[in-house]
Amino acid sequence: SETTTGTSSNSSQSTSNSGLAPNPTNATTKAAG
């Protein structure tokens, strides 16, 4: 069976098994203060 790894969001292949979101958000940062 074929391994499913981190694939692009426009691919038909699922990204779930890679453990990574298909288009991860950039982590929000709080301003120092």
């Epitope: 074929e2 391994t3 790894t5 981190g6 694939t7 692009s8 426009n10 691919s11 292949q13 990204t15 779930s16 098994n17 890679s18 453990g19 990574l20 979101a21 298909p22 991860p24 958000t25 950039n26 982590a27 929000t28």
Partner: antibody, heavy 115, light 112 residues
Framework: EVKLEESGGGLVQPGGSMKLSCVAS????????MNWVRQSPERGLDWVAQ??????????RYVESVKGRFTISRDDSKNSVYLQMNNLRAEDTGIYYC??????WSQGTTLTVSS | DVVVTQTPLTLSVTIGQTASISCKSS???????????LNWLFQRPGQSPKRLIY???NLDSGVPDRFTGSGSGTDFTLKISRVEAEDLGVYYC?????????FGGGTKLEIK
């Protein structure tokens, strides 16, 4: 069977360069994002870089600490991913792994940056 | 960056007992597709990490069902029931929802 086999690594002086390579087999490489992760006693596990697919125009992402110094690239015809590291610093020392995501990991290769 | 905090740092258990490891993130790991990209890895000394669990609770192939992942949002747990000698090593959680992906500091499981 999925295999990720690395080459490269070793001892390099601060300010120097090193290129790591990783050859993949056992899965459809052209459909897979590829990543480099490093590990050190001081910082633990640290995601370094990611490269996406041809259909994504080989988009890349880097952790802030390596931006402008490291370049991830891939050659789909060779099922290979590379990490070119320039202007190396002592804090870049560690074991470098190539990974498909969180699921498959190479054996790791050690980079030591020291004078 | 999303801060991932694991506790305890070291866990000393008797063979046959249950071990529990906590992983907390500074931001929710729930992605817009309804999935939560929280993974658990295991590493023995001198070896590369091996994934045990993905999407909070899904066991990888070959991982015994003694391992259970649970949680949601920012709070996650790995439970190892009936601990065996082969379970000793370091366990890491890693989030794949936000870039840069970030790891917990690890929990070393020791056998009493």
């Amino acid at each position: 069977e999925v295999k990720l086999e690395e080459s490269g690594g070793g001892l390099v002086q601060p300010g120097g360069s090193m290129k790591l390579s990783c050859v993949a087999s056992g899965f459809t490489f052209t459909n897979s994002w590829m990543n480099w992760v490093r590990q050190s006693p001081e910082r633990g596990l640290d995601w370094v870089a990611q490269i996406q697919l041809k259909s994504d125009n080989y988009a890349t992402r880097y952790v802030e600490s390596v931006k402008g110094r490291f370049t991830i690239s891939r050659d789909d015809s060779k099922n290979s991913v590379y990490l070119q590291m320039n202007n190396l610093r002592a804090e870049d020392t560690g074991i470098y792994y190539c990974t498909t995501g969180t699921d498959y990991w190479s054996q790791g290769t050690t980079l030591t940056v020291s004078s | 960056d999303v801060v991932v905090t694991q506790t305890p740092l070291t866990l000393s258990v008797t063979i046959g007992q249950t071990a529990s490891i906590s992983c907390k993130s500074s931001q929710s790991l729930l992605f817009s597709n309804g999935k939560t990209y929280l993974n658990w890895l295991f590493q023995r000394p001198g070896q590369s990490p091996k994934r045990l669990i993905y999407l909070v609770s899904n066991l990888d192939s070959g991982v015994p069902d003694r391992f259970t992942g649970s949680g949601s949002g920012t709070d996650f747990t790995l439970k190892i029931s009936r601990v065996e000698a082969e379970d000793l090593g370091v366990y890491y959680c890693v989030q794949g929802t936000h870039f840069p992906y970030t790891f917990g500091g690890g929990t070393k499981l020791e056998i009493k």
